[in-house]
């Protein structure tokens, strides 16, 4: 956020940039939280995203029986590993094809017994406030589908008729990790020392990190003809003085006619 300065007063302005603002020769370059000619004002809204997508990772183990283990499979750069990865990925893409959140699989380790495949199933969904539910449902469908395929695609007389066959009892879900997105926490962190006064409000399922000085939200402070300004003690209304009135009160809603005050003073003198 920048404010340009022209004229002789600029050199004085340079040394007066506040709140970590830096002078670039023309203006104070303000940190994210501030604006104004001297970076003296606190912003009333902070961009907290959200991220376009949220990811989840499921750590799974399956046992492939249609491939015999060889030592080369331990080496991720070997031709054996690459061919196994290709077939396994194709097979899993088929298994999970009906899950819109499915992104792919990542093999982390192959070990003996026939071939025990430690891998991650990667899921992703567009951010909405319900992303946790969406990803929780997707992980349940992953469990169902992998259980089904490892039960159905099995060896018969040491022969597999499918792209891959599995050991029914070798399927395990080790861990599920969902990327945490907490707009409230992000908002509090980015508002720094003003964190107690910034809140998250939703509009069209998008979170907005705002202080009461941001108009148009349910928490917005109505300063009437005054100006809302954030300080370390919270939002305050700076009341204006017009040609005819002084305004006061917490929300600048109390107007006092100057002529009455002057008249009163005049009367006392």
């Amino acid at each position: 956020r920048t404010t340009t300065c022209f004229g002789d007063g600029c050199q004085n302005t340079a040394s007066r940039c506040k709140n970590g603002g830096t002078w670039d020769g023309l203006k104070c370059q303000c940190p994210n939280l501030y604006y104004g000619e001297l970076c003296e004002e606190v912003v009333s809204s902070i961009d907290i995203g959200p991220p376009e997508t949220i990811s989840a990772q499921m750590e799974l183990t399956v046992t492939v029986t249609s491939v015999k283990f060889t030592e080369e499979l331990k080496n991720h750069s070997s031709q054996e590993f690459q061919e196994f990865k290709q077939t396994f990925t194709e097979q899993m893409n088929i298994v999970y094809s009906g899950i819109p959140e499915y992104v792919g699989v990542n093999i982390t380790k192959l070990r003996l017994g026939s071939v025990v495949v430690e891998h991650d199933v990667l899921l992703r969904t567009k951010y909405t406030p319900e992303y946790k539910t969406v990803l929780d449902n997707a992980t349940e469908v992953v469990k169902e589908k992998i259980t089904k395929v490892t039960t159905q695609q099995i060896m018969i007389n040491d022969i597999c008729s499918d792209m891959m066959c599995f050991n029914t009892t070798g399927t395990q879900v080790q861990n599920i990790t969902v990327t945490q997105y907490d707009p409230e926490e992000d908002c509090r962190k980015m508002a720094k020392e003003y964190g107690d006064y910034f809140v998250v409000e939703y509009r069209d399922q998008k979170p907005y990190c705002i202080s009461p000085c941001e108009p148009g939200f349910s928490v917005s402070k109505n300063c009437n003809l005054g100006k809302c300004q954030m300080s370390l003690s919270g939002p305050q209304c700076l009341c204006v003085t017009t040609e005819t009135h002084w305004y006061s009160g917490e929300t600048c809603n109390q107007g006092t006619q100057k002529s009455l005050v002057y008249g009163h003073h005049h009367h006392h003198h």
């Epitope: 249609s66 491939v67 077939t87 022969i159 597999c160």
Partner: nanobody, 123 residues
């Protein structure tokens, strides 16, 4: 990358014999799995005979006792000896390979393929 080139196909009368060859380039011939698949017009590709570096072999029920798969590691060549040929053996025959020790008949699990050689059994 493994390159496979089949030869030996042709037209033969029922009861006749043919020997198919599959020449492989690359240093992977002694390991993994090798196989012969065939595909008749309008039908899916099917496994005919398979062999793995651990000594395992497979023959489709329809060719057992008539076909023999073998390999010559010194020549990097895979063979399919076909005896007592029948009209139903008519198909395009493909050589397939994988560096993995496979136990699957499904063509999707096999990574390397030749262009095929035509076998026609007809009187």
């Amino acid at each position: 990358e493994v390159q496979l080139v089949e030869s030996g196909g042709g037209v033969v009368q029922p009861g006749g014999s043919l020997r198919l060859s599959c020449a492989a380039s690359g240093d992977t011939f002694s390991r993994g799995s090798w196989g012969w698949f065939r595909q008749a017009p309008g039908k899916e590709r099917e496994a005919v005979a398979l062999i793995s570096s651990d000594g395992w072999t497979f023959y489709a029920d329809s060719v057992k006792g008539r076909f023999t798969i073998s390999q010559d590691n010194s020549k990097n060549t895979l063979y399919l000896q076909m005896n007592s040929l029948r009209a139903e053996d008519t198909a395009m025959y493909y050589c397939a390979a994988s560096v993995l020790v496979l136990r699957t008949l499904n063509p999707k699990a096999w990574h390397h393929w030749g262009q095929g050689t035509q076998v026609t059994v007809s009187s």
